[in-house]
């Protein structure tokens, strides 16, 4: 290969300009890797390698800087880009280079890494009495941290679990909703409430249980006064 010493720079630029890259549709290999293929219209001695440029695309990512993966083997026409974010749509392009000189960009192609279930729970889960005189509670939360969502959050699952299955209540809301009202809680039953985000790959990590128990008037019982039904029964049994 020629070096930049004693090389006609105009010739380098001209040859790099003629070396048009055609990017094929990328192949998604996993939740964190994408394989990129390309062909060169006109091979040249003045191609030292290829720069594969990629970045997350979409409204919520803005115009982020291009990340660069260098391929320093001119004969090579494919590469696997590793360490990508899960469930993220990427725009990808390629360009040839020779030392500090760079050729024209290929067309841009798009590929989305595979989603995984979120690896962190929703944040800031709160459980409170809902307005009104019924036995309903309001469960609120914030999404998991963005880098743990591992894709687009499609829905949130809420589990409101009493001490027996007949007291269980499950709710599902869409991914843009961050609260849900759960009606008809049974007074005197201690419920644990958990929330998890779900992507297309499934349900993620559940939040730490939050406990709530309503008294006969439908008002929350303070945590130190919360006693399970089983405990109440066992206390009665222990009485002489």
């Amino acid at each position: 290969l020629p070096t930049s010493q004693g090389v006609d720079h105009k010739q380098v630029q001209r040859e790099l300009g003629n070396a048009v890259l055609h990017l094929h549709n990328p192949t998604v290999l996993s939740s964190s890797s994408i394989e990129v293929h390309w062909t060169v219209d006109q091979q040249s001695q003045y191609i030292q390698g290829y720069k594969i440029l990629y970045r997350p695309s979409g409204a919520n990512h803005g115009e982020s800087d291009w990340l660069v993966f260098e391929v320093r083997t001119p004969a090579k026409n494919s590469v696997v880009i590793p360490d990508l974010r899960k469930g993220v749509n990427y725009e990808i392009k390629a360009r040839p280079f020779f030392n500090e000189f760079q050729g024209a960009d290929s067309e841009i192609k798009f590929a989305k890494t595979l989603e995984e279930a979120p690896s962190a729970p929703p944040q800031g889960v709160t459980v409170s009495k809902n307005d009104g005189n019924g036995t309903a509670i309001l469960v609120s939360w914030q999404p998991p941290p963005e880098d743990t969502q591992n894709g687009m959050v499609q829905e949130y699952k809420v589990w409101c679990l009493g001490n027996e299955t007949r007291y269980h209540i499950n709710k599902t809301v869409d991914g843009s909703t961050f609260s849900v009202v759960i009606p008809f809680l049974v007074p005197g039953i201690r419920y644990s409430v958990e929330v998890a985000a779900s992507t297309g790959a499934g349900s993620g990590v559940k939040s730490e249980p939050q406990f709530i128990q309503l008294d006969a008037h439908g008002n929350p019982v303070s945590p130190e006064d919360q006693v399970s039904l089983a405990q109440q029964i066992s206390d009665v049994v222990k009485q002489p």
């Epitope: 036995t135 299955t165 007949r166 007291y167 269980h168 209540i169 499950n170 709710k171 599902t172 809301v173 009606p183 008809f184 049974v186 007074p187």
Partner: antibody
Framework: LQQSGPELVKPGASVKISCKAS????????MNWVKLSHGKSLEWIGD????????TYNQNFRGKATLTVDKSSSTAYMELRSLTSEDSAVYYC????????????WGQGTTITVS | IQMTQTTSSLSASLGDRVTISCRAS??????LNWYQQKPDGTVKLLIY???RLHSGVPSRFSGSGSGTDFSLTISKLEQEDIATYFC?????????FGAGTKLELK
Amino acid sequence: LQQSGPELVKPGASVKISCKASGYTFTDYYMNWVKLSHGKSLEWIGDIVPNNGDTTYNQNFRGKATLTVDKSSSTAYMELRSLTSEDSAVYYCARFSNYVYPFDYWGQGTTITVS
Amino acid sequence: IQMTQTTSSLSASLGDRVTISCRASQDISNFLNWYQQKPDGTVKLLIYYTSRLHSGVPSRFSGSGSGTDFSLTISKLEQEDIATYFCQQGNTLPLTFGAGTKLELK
């Protein structure tokens, strides 16, 4: 909960009625069926868990009613077989979260006449 | 569990206080719900867990009782309350209903 229209059927025949759910997540609630007849008031037929198709029947309706769901269309179905005049009634679908919770929404009812 | 509504029909005037009773054949704790069936057949939940008012139900409706004896009260009867009222227990399978009390105008 939107139920299918009235049915006039012959004795010995079968009939399948539907209940289409909208406005909530279909798999979050048990779907129940209730019979309203002049002689016997309201009778709970049974329920189905849309998520997995699990059913629980009132013993009195075992062999008479079969409950199914189609998750893709958020629709519950009840088939009644070997119909007799005793089966002439209004049939309601109704939802609840679990057994101790009330039926908070009901369909408008489907009238079945066996004649 | 058998649910008994002893009064099958009840006549009252607009503005009256009306009480409908329901008895369970065994202790059902507070797992007692009341439903209203209008003449056109539509059914609505009124009261759950004996005394809790379902959202959107007028405050003239109230419920009370525990164990085996329960009642539904309408403090001031209005025209739109003319309907049949059913109690239902949620304590034990199979779920069972009372025979209904039909409320009519005098």
